[in-house]
C-alpha cells in the first residue's frame, strides 16, 4: 500500500476520489476525511511472505503487526473484508512468532461492539509473543510443478501446474492470458483490453483447460466488468494492468485455483527464479499454441534492463524484466496478460503480468512484465469498490 500520493508532499496522503491531500495523522483515525471515505478503509494490509496482518496507526503514522492476544476468526474475516475479499473466500488465520517486533496493535476487548479499528490501540508489549497471520483466500497452491519447457519453442504444461492461468477469448479466439486472484477476479494486461476490446461483453474466460480445442461456447465464463488501470499509457505500456470481473464465480478445484497477490515487504532478488505460462506463439510471428506452455525465467535487475544495450531506459518502476539476456526463452504474442510467478515459502506469487518485448526470445531483448507489486493497492481498491 503506497501512501505517498503523487500530488501530495512527502508527508501527505492523497484521496483517490478527489485528489485532495490529507495529513497522515488523519488516516485511519475513525473519521472520514476523504469524500469517498477511503482514508478509513485502507487501514489494513498483509505483510511479507507470511501474511502478517498489519494495521496503520494514525498516532505513529506507520504500520504495525496485530498482537494475537484476544484475536479471533471474526476479526480476521473483517480485516479480509476490508481489504476487498469476500467473506466466503476466507481461508485461515495463523500465528507467527513476533520476530522481534517492538510495536504492536492490540485489541481492547472492553471497547464494546464497535468497528474493529476502534478496538485496536497501540502497545509496546504483546503477552502472547505472537502476531496474527491472515490468509484471506487459499491461494498459490498448485498440483504439479511443470517440467522445464518454453513458451517459445517448448513443451506443454502439466495439468494443475498453473491452475490460476486463464485463456481470454474474443469471438471464440484466444486473445490474451490472465491470472485468477479470487473466484470472481482475473488480472490481465491493460493492452489486452484497449479499444475496441474494452467492453466486457466481448470477453469469455476459460479456466482449468489446457488445450484451446477444448474451449468452446458454454464452457467459458462471461466477463461482467473490465477495469483498465487509469494511468495506463498505450505508447510506453506503463501501468499495463487490468482487471476482469466474471459474471459468475469460478468453482475452485485441482485445476482451477487462485495465485497469491504479492504482499508489501516481499523482496525480489535479481536472478530470482520465476515461471511464465501461456498459449502464445511458440516462435516469433507464429500462431497461438494449441496447448498451454510454461517456462523458467530469471528476473533481470531494472538497472541492467534499462542499460543502453537492452531497453535503454524504457523500463519504469511499474515494469519488471524477466528472461535470459542470451535469448531462447521468452513469452510471445498471445501470452500477454498471463502470469509471471515465483515460489516463496511453498506459495506461488503473481509477480508480473506479461506486457511487452522487442520480438520474442531475442538476445538482449527479455520479456517485460507489469510489476504487480506496484498495483496491489489499486487491485484491492477495485475489489473493495465492487463490494
Amino acid at each position: 500500500w503506497k501512501f505517498m500520493g503523487s500530488k501530495c508532499s512527502n508527508s501527505g496522503i492523497e484521496c483517490d476520489s478527489s485528489g485532495t491531500c490529507i495529513n497522515p495523522s488523519n488516516w485511519c483515525d475513525g473519521v472520514s476525511h476523504c469524500p469517498g471515505g477511503e482514508d478509513e478503509n485502507r487501514c489494513v494490509r498483509l505483510y511479507g511472505p507470511n501474511f502478517i496482518l498489519q494495521v496503520y496507526s494514525s498516532q505513529r503514522k506507520s504500520w504495525h503487526p496485530v498482537c494475537q492476544d484476544d484475536w479471533n476468526e471474526n476479526y480476521g474475516r473483517a480485516a479480509c473484508r476490508d481489504m476487498g475479499y469476500k467473506n466466503n473466500f476466507y481461508s485461515s488465520q495463523g500465528i507467527v512468532d513476533d520476530s522481534g517486533s517492538t510495536s504492536f496493535m492490540k485489541l481492547n476487548t472492553s471497547a464494546g461492539n464497535v468497528d474493529i479499528y476502534k478496538k485496536l490501540y497501540h502497545s509496546d508489549a504483546c503477552s502472547s509473543k505472537a502476531v496474527v497471520s491472515l490468509r484471506c483466500i487459499a491461494c498459490g497452491v498448485n498440483l504439479n510443478s511443470s517440467r522445464q519447457s518454453r513458451i517459445v519453442g517448448g513443451e506443454s504444461a502439466l495439468p494443475g501446474a498453473w491452475p490460476w492461468q486463464v485463456s481470454l477469448h474474443v469471438q471464440n479466439v484466444h486473445v490474451c492470458g490472465g491470472s485468477i486472484i479470487t473466484p470472481e477476479w482475473i488480472v490481465t494486461a491493460a493492452h489486452c483490453v484497449e479499444k475496441p476490446l474494452n467492453n466486457p461483453w466481448h470477453w469469455t474466460a476459460f479456466a482449468g483447460i489446457l488445450r484451446q480445442s477444448f474451449m468452446f461456447y458454454g464452457a467459458g465464463y462471461q466477463v461482467e466488468k473490465v477495469i483498465s488501470h487509469p494511468n495506463y499509457d498505450s505508447k510506453t505500456k506503463n501501468n499495463d494492468i487490468a482487471l476482469m470481473k466474471l459474471q459468475k464465480p469460478l468453482t475452485f478445484n485441482d485445476l482451477v485455483k487462485p495465485v497469491c497477490l504479492p504482499n508489501p515487504g516481499m523482496m525480489l532478488q535479481p536472478e530470482q527464479l520465476c515461471w511464465i505460462s501461456g498459449w502464445g506463439a511458440t516462435e516469433e510471428k507464429g500462431k497461438t499454441s494449441e496447448v498451454l506452455n510454461a517456462a523458467k525465467v530469471l528476473l533481470i535487475e531494472t538497472q541492467r534492463c534499462n542499460s543502453r544495450y537492452v531497453y535503454d531506459n524504457l523500463i519504469t518502476p511499474a515494469m519488471i524484466c524477466a528472461g535470459f539476456l542470451q535469448g531462447n526463452v521468452d513469452s510471445c504474442q498471445g501470452d500477454s496478460g498471463g502470469p509471471l510467478v515465483t515460489s516463496k515459502n511453498n506459495i506461488w506469487w503473481l509477480i508480473g503480468d506479461t506486457s511487452w518485448g522487442s520480438g520474442c526470445a531475442k538476445a538482449y531483448r527479455p520479456g517485460v512484465y507489469g510489476n504487480v507489486m506496484v498495483f496491489t493497492d489499486w487491485i484491492y481498491r477495485q475489489m473493495r469498490a465492487d463490494g
Partner: antibody, heavy 118, light 109 residues
Framework: EVQLQQSGPELVKPGASVKISCKAS????????MNWVKRRHGKSLEWIGN????????SYNQKFKGKATLTVDKSSSTAYMELRSLTSEDSVVYYC???????????WGQGTLVTVSA | QAVVTQESALTTSPGETVTLTCRSS?????????ANWVQEKPDHLFTGLIG???NRAPGVPARFSGSLIGDKAALTITGAQTEDEAIYFC?????????FGGGTKLTVL
C-alpha cells in the same frame, strides 16, 4: 461529430445478393465495433452481428449465419454488409450502429432500405 | 433464443415520471445482460440512451436513468417532456448475441 452514412436504397431480384455500406467519420474507425441491425416492418429490431474493424473479427446471430457477411475497409473507414440469397423476408431497413464505451448501439446510421422484388 | 418483452405502449403527461421495463424470458435481468436502451424518434433516427444497465450516454439529459428493478431492466424518465415522445427499445446480451425487445411507444400528451 460521429457520423455513420449508409448507402442508398436497393431494389434487387429474389435469389440475388446486395452489399450495403456504412461510412464512418468523426472518430477513429478502428476504435469501436460496428453492429448491424435489421428493422422489421412494424417496429421490432434484430441484431445481425458485429465486426471488429481492427482485425475483421466477426460475431453473428445464429439466424443470420450464411445470410449476412460483414467486412470492413480500414482505408476508407467503411463497414459493409453483404446479404445473399435474398427473399421477400429480407425486404426491410438495415442499420449500422457503432459501439461506445459500455454502449453496444451508441450511434446509428440513417438506415438502408432493401426491396426484394421480381 | 431468449425473448425480450416490453410494454407495447405507455402514455404520460409532461412533467410526470414514467418507467418502461424490459423482461427476459429466461429469468432475471442482471448486470451481465448489459441492458441498454435506444430511442427512435418519429423520423427513424435512433440514439443510444443508456448502456450497461445504468450508464447514460454523453449528451443524454439527466431525466433519463436506467436501473434493474426486481427481475427486469427499467428506463425511468423523470419529468417527461413532449420531445420524449418516441419508441424506446431495450436490448439484452445473452452470452454471445444481443436480443432486442419489441419496443415501447411512449406518448407524451
Amino acid at each position: 461529430e460521429v457520423q455513420l452514412q449508409q448507402s442508398g436504397p436497393e431494389l434487387v431480384k429474389p435469389g440475388a445478393s446486395v452489399k450495403i455500406s456504412c461510412k464512418a467519420s468523426g472518430y477513429t474507425f478502428t476504435d469501436y465495433y460496428m453492429n448491424w441491425v435489421k428493422r422489421r416492418h412494424g417496429k421490432s429490431l434484430e441484431w445481425i452481428g458485429n465486426i471488429n474493424p481492427n482485425n475483421g473479427g466477426t460475431s453473428y446471430n445464429q439466424k443470420f449465419k450464411g445470410k449476412a457477411t460483414l467486412t470492413v475497409d480500414k482505408s476508407s473507414s467503411t463497414a459493409y454488409m453483404e446479404l445473399r440469397s435474398l427473399t421477400s423476408e429480407d425486404s426491410v431497413v438495415y442499420y449500422c450502429a457503432r459501439e461506445g464505451d459500455l454502449f453496444p448501439f451508441a450511434y446509428w446510421g440513417q438506415g438502408t432500405l432493401v426491396t426484394v422484388s421480381a | 433464443q431468449a425473448v425480450v418483452t416490453q410494454e407495447s405502449a405507455l402514455t404520460t403527461s409532461p412533467g410526470e415520471t414514467v418507467t418502461l421495463t424490459c423482461r427476459s424470458s429466461i429469468g432475471t435481468v442482471t448486470t451481465s445482460n448489459f441492458a441498454n436502451w435506444v430511442q427512435e424518434k418519429p423520423d427513424h433516427l435512433f440514439t443510444g440512451l443508456i448502456g450497461a444497465s445504468n450508464n447514460r450516454a454523453p449528451g443524454v439529459p439527466a431525466r433519463f436513468s436506467g436501473s434493474l428493478i426486481g427481475d427486469k431492466a427499467a428506463l425511468t424518465i423523470t419529468g417527461a417532456q413532449t420531445e420524449d415522445e418516441a419508441i424506446y427499445f431495450c436490448a439484452l446480451w445473452f452470452s454471445n448475441h444481443w436480443v432486442f425487445g419489441g419496443g415501447t411507444k411512449l406518448t407524451v400528451l
